[in-house]
C-alpha cells in the first residue's frame, strides 16, 4: 500500500487566442494549482472538447458568469 496517491495535475500551457461562442460551451473548470505556470480556465464544449482560456480576458470571465447563471437557473 503506497503512502500517498499521486493525483495527475491538469495545467494549461497555451491558451486559445479567439473567443468561443457561448452557445458552444457546456461547463468550465478553474486551474489555480501553483504547480501550473498560469492560472487558467478549461472550457468544455458541447462536443466534448476541452479548451484552455485566459481568465484575464473579458470574454472568458463573461462566459464563466454566463455558465454560472445557467447552472443556477437549472437548480430546483
Amino acid at each position: 500500500q503506497p503512502d500517498s496517491v499521486s493525483i495527475p495535475i491538469t495545467c494549461c500551457f497555451n491558451v486559445i487566442n479567439r473567443k468561443i461562442p457561448i452557445q458552444r460551451l457546456e461547463s468550465y473548470t478553474r486551474i489555480t494549482n501553483i504547480q501550473c505556470p498560469k492560472e487558467a480556465v478549461i472550457f468544455k464544449t458541447k462536443r466534448g472538447k476541452e479548451v484552455c482560456a485566459d481568465p484575464k480576458e473579458r470574454w472568458v470571465r463573461d462566459s464563466m458568469k454566463h455558465l454560472d447563471q445557467i447552472f443556477q437557473n437549472l437548480k430546483p
Epitope: 505556470p37 484575464k56 458568469k65
Partner: antibody
Framework: EVQLQQSGAELVKAGASVKLSCPAS????????MHWVKQRPEQGLEWIGR????????KFDPKFQGKATITADTSSNTAYLQLSSLTSEDTAVYYC??????????WGQGTTLTVSS | DIQMTQSSSSFSVSLGDRVTITCKAT??????LAWYQQKPGSAPRLLIS???SLETGVPSRFSGSGSGKDYTLSITSLQTEDVATYYC?????????FGGGTKLEIK
C-alpha cells in the same frame, strides 16, 4: 513554492505617503492579478484593489480611489501599493495576494503600517 | 456593492464540537464564495473557493455549502488548531467584499 515577501513594518508621519512592496517568487506575476487587502487593528478585511501586471490595468474599491495607487514591475516581479495623504485611519496591516478569479490563494505575511502624528 | 453578513461575530465552542458558520450576501452571488481562516498575527489562509471546493491541504473536516445568497462553513469535529477567525468573501463582482468575521473561542 510561491512566496509573496512583504516588509514587516513601516512607521510614517501623518500627511506623508508610503509605498509598500510585494516581491513574488515561485510565480510570474504577469500570469495572475495582484491584489491588496487592508486589515485595521482588531477589524475585518477590506479589498483595496488589484492590478493586471501584464498591462498595468487596475481596479479599485471606490472608497480607496484617490487614496491608493497600485503598480507593478514585471522585471523585478514585484507589486506595489502607494498610499497618499496618510491619516490615523490608514494605520493597518496591508496584505498583497494573488488571484485571477477574485479569491486569494496566496498571501504575503502583511506589512504593518503605523501612521504617527 | 454586495454586502456580506456573518451572523455571529464570535461564539464559544468546545473541542470536538460540530461548528457551523453562516454568511449571507445582499444578492445572488452564484456560488462565487470563498472562506478564509485567520489566526492572530498571520495572513488569512484560503480554505474553500466556489462555495464548496476545498483547497489542497485543507483537512476534510472542513466543508462548504449553500447557493444563491446563503452559504455555510462547517467543521465536523473542532480541533485545537481550528480556533481562529473565519471570513467569507464574495468574488462574483468587484469590489470584492468580506464578511465581518466569526471568531471561535474555546469555552
Amino acid at each position: 513554492e510561491v512566496q509573496l515577501q512583504q516588509s514587516g513594518a513601516e512607521l510614517v508621519k501623518a500627511g506623508a505617503s508610503v509605498k509598500l512592496s510585494c516581491p513574488a517568487s515561485g510565480l510570474n506575476i504577469k500570469d495572475t492579478y495582484m491584489h491588496w487587502v487592508k486589515q485595521r487593528p482588531e477589524q475585518g478585511l477590506e479589498w483595496i484593489g488589484r492590478i493586471d501586471p501584464a498591462n498595468g490595468n487596475t481596479k479599485f474599491d471606490p472608497k480607496f480611489q484617490g487614496k491608493a495607487t497600485i503598480t507593478a514591475d514585471t522585471s523585478s516581479n514585484t507589486a506595489y501599493l502607494q498610499l497618499s495623504s496618510l491619516t490615523s485611519e490608514d494605520t493597518a496591516v496591508y496584505y498583497c495576494a494573488r488571484g485571477v478569479f477574485g479569491f486569494f490563494d496566496y498571501w504575503g505575511q502583511g506589512t504593518t503600517l503605523t501612521v504617527s502624528s | 456593492d454586495i454586502q456580506m453578513t456573518q451572523s455571529s461575530s464570535s461564539f464559544s465552542v468546545s473541542l470536538g464540537d460540530r461548528v457551523t458558520i453562516t454568511c449571507k450576501a445582499t444578492e445572488d452571488i452564484y456560488n462565487r464564495l470563498a472562506w478564509y481562516q485567520q489566526k492572530p498575527g498571520s495572513a488569512p489562509r484560503l480554505l474553500i473557493s466556489g462555495a464548496t471546493s476545498l483547497e489542497t491541504g485543507v483537512p476534510s473536516r472542513f466543508s462548504g455549502s449553500g447557493s444563491g445568497k446563503d452559504y455555510t462553513l462547517s467543521i465536523t469535529s473542532l480541533q485545537t488548531e481550528d480556533v481562529a477567525t473565519y471570513y467569507c468573501q464574495q468574488f462574483w463582482s468587484a469590489p470584492y467584499t468580506f464578511g465581518g468575521g466569526t471568531k471561535l473561542e474555546i469555552k
